[in-house]
Interface confidence: medium
């Protein structure tokens, strides 16, 4: 069953997803989609990374985290009730049927009546994180040079509170941890 995350209308939602490359610096393609993870790829893709950088994004969807910690958590800006639903984070590990798929359920609550917008920590008790940024996607993305082959040993999503400000100091302490290879 999906892990549930909450946000309020008008605020930013945070959907956690992490992976740990076998060797630092080895990026794995990741896609985020609206709807449960299908057999292949992501349906209704909202953001995609390749081995070098983000290569596709749509307005309001982006990554705010620290790649050094394998953080590919999705931020959805200025959510509406229509943003409720299942989201798929898919870590696209090379090889046939090697992908790791995580379905996360986002529940949007009507906004509380407040005189002015405030910074909020209202996602879940497990993820008390402040997100109040603006913007509409990177004006340009750039290509990095070649990276070594990818060989993942561990894929993680977060289901408990992470223990440091980088959100992923020790991924072994996070929720589901899958080791491969």
């Amino acid at each position: 069953s999906e892990v549930e995350y909450r946000a309020e209308v008008g605020q930013n939602a945070y959907l956690p997803c992490f992976y740990t490359p076998a060797a630092p610096g080895n990026l794995v393609p990741v896609c985020w989609g609206k709807g449960a993870c299908p057999v292949f790829e992501c349906g209704n893709v909202v953001l995609r990374t390749d081995e070098r950088d983000v290569n596709y994004w749509t307005s309001r969807y982006w990554l705010n985290g620290d790649f050094r910690k394998g953080d590919v958590s999705l931020t959805i800006e200025n959510v509406t009730l229509a943003d409720s639903g299942i989201y798929c984070c898919r870590i696209q590990i090379p090889g046939i049927m090697n992908d790791e798929k995580f379905n996360l359920k986002l529940v949007i609550k009507p906004a509380k009546v407040t005189p002015a917008p405030t910074r909020q920590r209202d996602f879940t008790a497990a993820f008390p994180r402040m997100l109040t940024t603006r913007g509409h996607g990177p004006a340009e993305t750039q290509t990095l040079g070649s990276l070594p082959d990818i060989n993942l040993t561990q894929i993680s999503t977060l289901a408990n509170e992470l223990r440091d400000s980088r959100l992923a100091n020790d991924l072994r302490d996070s929720g589901a941890t899958i080791r491969i290879g």
Epitope: N64, T75, R134
Partner: antibody, heavy 123, light 109 residues
Framework: EVKLLESGGGLVQPGGSLKLSCAAS????????MSWVRQAPGKGLEWIGE????????NYTPSLKDKFLISRDNAKNTLYLQMSKVRSEDTALYYC????????????????WGQGTLVTVSA | QAVVTQESALTTSPGETVTLTCRSS?????????ANWVQEKPDHLFTGLIG???NRAPGVPARFSGSLIGDKAALTITGAQTEDEAIYFC?????????FGGGTKLTVL
Amino acid sequence: EVKLLESGGGLVQPGGSLKLSCAASGFDFSRYWMSWVRQAPGKGLEWIGEINPDSSTINYTPSLKDKFLISRDNAKNTLYLQMSKVRSEDTALYYCARPNGYYVGTIFPFAYWGQGTLVTVSA
Amino acid sequence: QAVVTQESALTTSPGETVTLTCRSSTGAVTTSNYANWVQEKPDHLFTGLIGGTNNRAPGVPARFSGSLIGDKAALTITGAQTEDEAIYFCALWYSNHWVFGGGTKLTVL
């Protein structure tokens, strides 16, 4: 074209405070990690710290974290460095730097640099 | 705090290959240190060359390459040119902060 323009430097007395700014243009500032780096006269580079896009994560070099404060205003496309309790050894050119790529920015933070602003600490 | 050490100065000739290195006081440099290389030209003009050990920035000539050699990070210039004369700084990541080396003054003559 990526442009970073530092300002706010000048002469400050020991023990005083100063706030530096870095105005960014030519890219979507709100998507990028940003760093401050300094260079004392005739010396090498010293990393001061970095801030992530929504200000939820800020890292400092251990020796400076109690006297410097990094912040940003994404609406103004501006990065800030608040300096306090300055001493003569804080005399330096102060630079802001932007990464290459916003997703992998944390592993390549020093791709683009401003021209620097000079801070002189003297009585 | 870790200390990052570079050669203070190196001299090469146009067309030659030269390698600058970056050593960590804490032990071998690994990919987890995400070595960066920055070039300083006269008038304090800085340009990032390499990040994440081996990734070239856009517009950086292919003659610049980053790698790990033994227990050190390395910047190799294959076929050095006169315009490559500059100071080169490396920076290494240590869990929650970056540390720069003292820089290598490269002379091309």
